[in-house]
């Protein structure tokens, strides 16, 4: 039974490689998937000596290890690329690294949008 799942319809979108891949650089992504399959949002990034380099954000296809995650939290210790996924619209707006070995929790907030 899939109790209490947060339905994901839209995610924050970002692609650092947008020029080469001929996509938008950032925005919102409407998630599309097969009927009866769950959808998630994800974020991926690099951490070079404390400098966060966002790689990609967007929709993520049905992945069991993303089920029931309300927040985007990466737990791998020191990967080349950090990854997190979550359920719920725009849940990938902010993302966190919480290493399993009990290091400091680091949360990355999106920069505030410039006033129009």
């Amino acid at each position: 039974s899939g109790r209490g799942e947060a339905e994901t319809r839209e995610c924050i979108y970002y692609n650092a490689n947008w020029e080469l891949e001929r996509t938008n650089q950032s925005g919102l992504e409407r998630c599309e998937g097969e009927q009866d399959k769950r959808l998630h949002c994800y974020a991926s990034w690099r951490n070079s000596s404390g400098t966060i380099e966002l790689v990609k954000k967007g929709c993520w296809l049905d992945d069991f290890n993303c089920y029931d995650r309300q927040e985007c939290v990466a737990t791998e210790e020191n990967p080349q690329v950090y990854f997190c996924c979550c359920e719920g619209n725009f849940c990938n707006e902010r993302f966190t690294h919480l290493p399993e070995a009990g290091g400091p929790e680091v949360t990355y907030e999106p920069p505030p949008t410039a006033p129009t």
């Epitope: 039974s1 769950r38 939290v73 399993e100």
Partner: antibody, heavy 118, light 111 residues
């Protein structure tokens, strides 16, 4: 080092019950989904059940629905499989497995044997 | 009911190349099923070889590779060795919390 240690297997009569446990160590148990997979003697692997990180979503193969219940205690780093109304065809080695992103089984326990026989 | 099919048995000469496949009765296997492959020797727990179609698990030699061939997932072993003689299982994640294992392929390394 990731370790998964199953226990609770044994001989049980048809219609009986057993509760399997899987003690996890070497990783933060609450951060990963988990699953049970079984293997009947001389047969192939068969997925049995899966449970999400919080325990809020549980899933079963058709042949065990209504008889088996998967659960987890994140404070005890333990996965459970409650097996009721056991049948001879449930005889198998039961493995617990850790599920990682892209829905694969990245670590396996050594298994515990369940024998259902009169 | 989804059935995942594998060749029941396969033989390969030492140093040879073998490709095991994994299909299913409901259409084509694609990367969205996150195909993964496991090796099992008698009396042992399975060992994870390949996940997410083509990513090798930690410590798996690069003689093992995964791909999509036509409408099936595939596991290729190049330069087969005697200790590759095992059972090999593919798994497809069908989504909605459901996995289906293939029936397994018994690989014999001749000689």
């Amino acid at each position: 080092e990731v370790q998964l240690l199953e226990s609770g297997g044994g001989l049980v009569q048809p219609g009986g019950s057993l509760r399997l446990s899987c003690a996890a160590s070497g990783f933060t148990f609450r951060n990963d989904a988990m699953s049970w997979v079984r293997q009947a003697p001389g047969k192939g692997l068969e997925w049995v059940s899966g449970i999400s990180v919080t325990g809020g979503s549980t899933f079963y193969t058709d042949s065990v629905k209504g008889r088996f219940t998967v659960s987890r205690d994140n404070s005890r780093n333990t996965l459970y499989l409650q097996m009721n109304s056991l049948r001879a065809e449930d005889t198998a080695v039961y493995y617990c497995a850790k599920v990682y992103y892209t829905s694969f089984f990245d670590y396996w326990g050594q298994g515990t044997l369940v024998t259902v026989s009169s | 009911q989804t059935v995942v099919t594998q060749e029941p048995s396969f033989s390969v000469s030492p140093g040879g190349t073998v490709t095991l496949t994994c299909g299913f009765n409901s259409g084509s296997v694609s990367t969205s099923y996150y195909p993964s492959w496991y090796q099992q020797t008698p009396g042992q727990a399975p060992r994870t070889l390949i996940y997410n179609t083509n990513t090798r698990s930690s410590g798996v030699p690069d003689r093992f590779s995964g791909s999509i061939l036509g409408n099936k997932a595939a596991l290729t072993i190049t330069g087969a060795q005697a200790d590759d003689e095992s059972d090999y299982y593919c798994v497809l994640y069908m989504g909605s919390g459901i996995w289906v294992f293939g029936g397994g392929t018994k690989l014999t390394v001749l000689g």
